[in-house]
Interface confidence: low
């Protein structure tokens, strides 16, 4: 009777890195000839294992194929990679010159489950300001199967992406996902986080997260005020320049007298607000007895390499 090649499993699923067994049994020991495993069909099929003396890395026979009565030609593939996905065929040959293929199994489709890489979130190269719309991109790669879920959150609130694409669109050994979301910045966002969450069958309901701290992508410009305090003595006037609610910390403050630089401040002791922004107060003591005429004092604040913010205050002469 004609030999039958039995591959009982139509398909198997295996996690990348794990091992899988592909079952194959024959109904007859005759005719004499080798059994070989291939991935794919036709001219492009790839030899995976041959029950001969050849060595095949990562592939071993499950049973003792040297035993004359053996009908089990199952193989174990270890350390499976996404590149191992495909349909595997157990093929019986009749010995000859050359060997002749006489029967093939029905094929076993191997689906390789590969975990996505940890999502990486990238934002704009330059800091944005409150009310500005900025885009964030999340990327993850190397996963299989193709089905994947990606969600965006900002401070616990789900955001709707502008675009999410999984590539390639056709069948492949592994896939990549890229998603873009648009966030409207506000002045309270210094402590905010944008989170990209990826869920996949391989992750056991524990999604992977990528985080972007908005503190790296926002600039909140200070509000600058100059005030004159009540004089502590007849000869002294106290001026205060207050820069409020700014981020990041990078701040330079210059006092000018009638347009001439009088003092350079490099703030060290900034006050941090609960919303993550900073305040800075600079005191400038004016010796009023030295000024017979009105003097214009200017507080010039340079924040994060932006154009200077200037506030003037006139101290009346004595």
């Amino acid at each position: 009777t004609e030999v039958k090649v039995i591959q009982p499993e139509k398909s198997v699923s295996v996690a990348a890195g794990d091992s899988t067994v592909l079952n194959c049994t024959l109904t007859s020991l005759l005719p004499v000839g080798p059994i070989r495993w291939y991935r794919g069909v036709g001219q492009s099929r790839q030899l995976i294992y041959s029950f001969t003396t050849e060595h095949f890395p990562r592939v071993t026979n499950v049973s003792d194929a040297t035993k004359r009565s053996n009908l089990d030609f199952s193989i174990r593939i270890s350390n499976v990679t996404p590149e191992d996905a495909g349909t595997y065929y157990c093929v019986k040959f009749q010995r000859g010159s050359p060997d002749t293929e006489i029967q093939s199994g029905g094929g076993t489709e191997v689906y390789v489950l590969a975990k996505p890489s940890p999502p990486e979130v990238s934002g704009p190269a330059d800091r944005g300001i409150p009310d500005q719309k900025v885009n964030f991109t999340c990327k993850s790669h190397g996963f299989s199967p193709r089905n994947i879920t990606l969600k965006w959150f900002k401070d616990g609130q789900e955001l709707h992406p502008l675009e999410t694409t999984v590539n390639p669109s056709g069948k492949n050994v592994s896939y990549n996902i890229s998603s873009t979301v648009r966030v409207v910045l506000n002045s309270m966002d210094v402590n905010s986080k944008v989170i990209c969450e990826v869920a996949h069958i391989t992750l056991d309901r524990s999604p992977l997260r990528g985080i972007a701290n908005l503190s790296n992508f926002i600039r909140v410009s200070p509000t600058v005020k100059v005030t004159q305090q009540s004089p502590t003595s007849m000869n002294q006037v106290n001026l205060t320049c207050r820069a409020e609610r700014f981020y990041p910390e990078d701040l330079q403050l210059i006092w000018l007298e009638n347009g001439n630089v009088s003092r350079n401040d490099t703030p060290k002791n900034l006050t941090k607000n609960t919303d993550g922004t900073y305040n800075y107060t600079s005191l400038f003591l004016v010796n009023s007895s030295a000024h017979r005429e009105d003097v214009v004092f200017t507080c010039q604040v340079k924040h994060d390499q932006q154009p200077a913010i200037t506030r003037n205050h006139t101290v009346l002469g004595f």
């Epitope: 039958k4 039995i6 499993e9 139509k10 079952n23 109904t27 009908l71 029905g106 489709e109």
Partner: antibody, heavy 119, light 107 residues
Framework: QVQLQESGPGLVKPSQTLSLTCTVS??????????WSWIRQHPGKGLEWIGA???????YYNPSLKSRVTISVDTSKNQFSLKLSSVTAADTAVYYC???????????WGQGTTVTVSS | DIQMTQSPSSLSASVGDRVTITCQAS??????LNWYQQKPGKAPKLLIY???NIEDGVPSRFSGSGSGTDFTFTISSLQPEDIATYYC?????????FGGGTKVEIK
């Protein structure tokens, strides 16, 4: 031309075991290359696959019934059989046996046998 | 388990009409899908295997197509003897599962 014929009691009492046999004629069950399946159909409902066997050993069951099902083959009688334990009224159905080829679906079916579970 | 969702559950068409039934799998099943016809009081009969291959002896008015998750079964010109319930069945994954069936009637 392979033909299949189911046989077994038409009435089974609750909690007992349902036993059916499928006799293969016109071909040998041991010729290889085929799945031999059991399928059932509840009254007025769709088809439910119970399980399948290949003569040389591998047996597959529907997980929803696995704890109660046994499928076996007797090549000497050219038969395969189904046992379903701890039956309830929900197991009342028409039971079919079928032959499954690798590339040809369930290409041969028995005519079906009605099993009623009632006391 | 793979869920097979068939639609519509029933339809009524005139003789000569083109009839289309769809079957959706809950996961990718490649082309591992069969279509069966079941007439009242009879066993199912295999019509289409591997999604698109017509079984020997089946009239050419029956055809199937699709791959992955979405499949279509078509009767190009409905005949009175086609009154039956049609089922899709996947065999990519165990347990093999059937669609809920589509009952075809003549107007």
């Amino acid at each position: 031309q392979v033909q299949l014929q189911e046989s077994g009691p038409g009435l089974v009492k609750p909690s007992q075991t349902l036993s059916l046999t499928c006799t293969v004629s016109g071909g040998s069950i041991s010729s290889g290359g085929y799945y031999w399946s059991w399928i059932r159909q509840h009254p007025g409902k769709g088809l439910e696959w119970i399980g399948a066997i290949y003569y040389s050993g591998p047996i597959y069951y529907n997980p929803s019934l696995k704890s109660r099902v046994t499928i076996s083959v007797d090549t000497s009688k050219n038969q395969f059989s189904l046992k379903l334990s701890s039956v309830t009224a929900a197991d009342t159905a028409v039971y079919y046996c079928s032959k499954e080829g690798y590339h040809s679906g369930m290409d041969v079916w028995g005519q079906g046998t009605t099993v009623t579970v009632s006391s | 388990d793979i869920q097979m969702t068939q639609s519509p559950s029933s339809l009524s068409a005139s003789v000569g009409d083109r009839v289309t039934i769809t079957c959706q799998a809950s996961d990718d099943i490649s082309d591992y899908l069969n279509w069966y016809q079941q007439k009242p009081g009879k066993a199912p009969k295999l019509l289409i295997y591997d999604a698109s291959n017509i079984e020997d002896g089946v009239p050419s008015r029956f055809s199937g197509s699709g791959s992955g998750t979405d499949f279509t079964f078509t009767i190009s010109s409905l005949q009175p003897e086609d009154i039956a319930t049609y089922y899709c069945q996947q065999f990519a994954y165990l347990p093999w599962t059937f669609g809920g069936g589509t009952k075809v009637e003549i107007k």
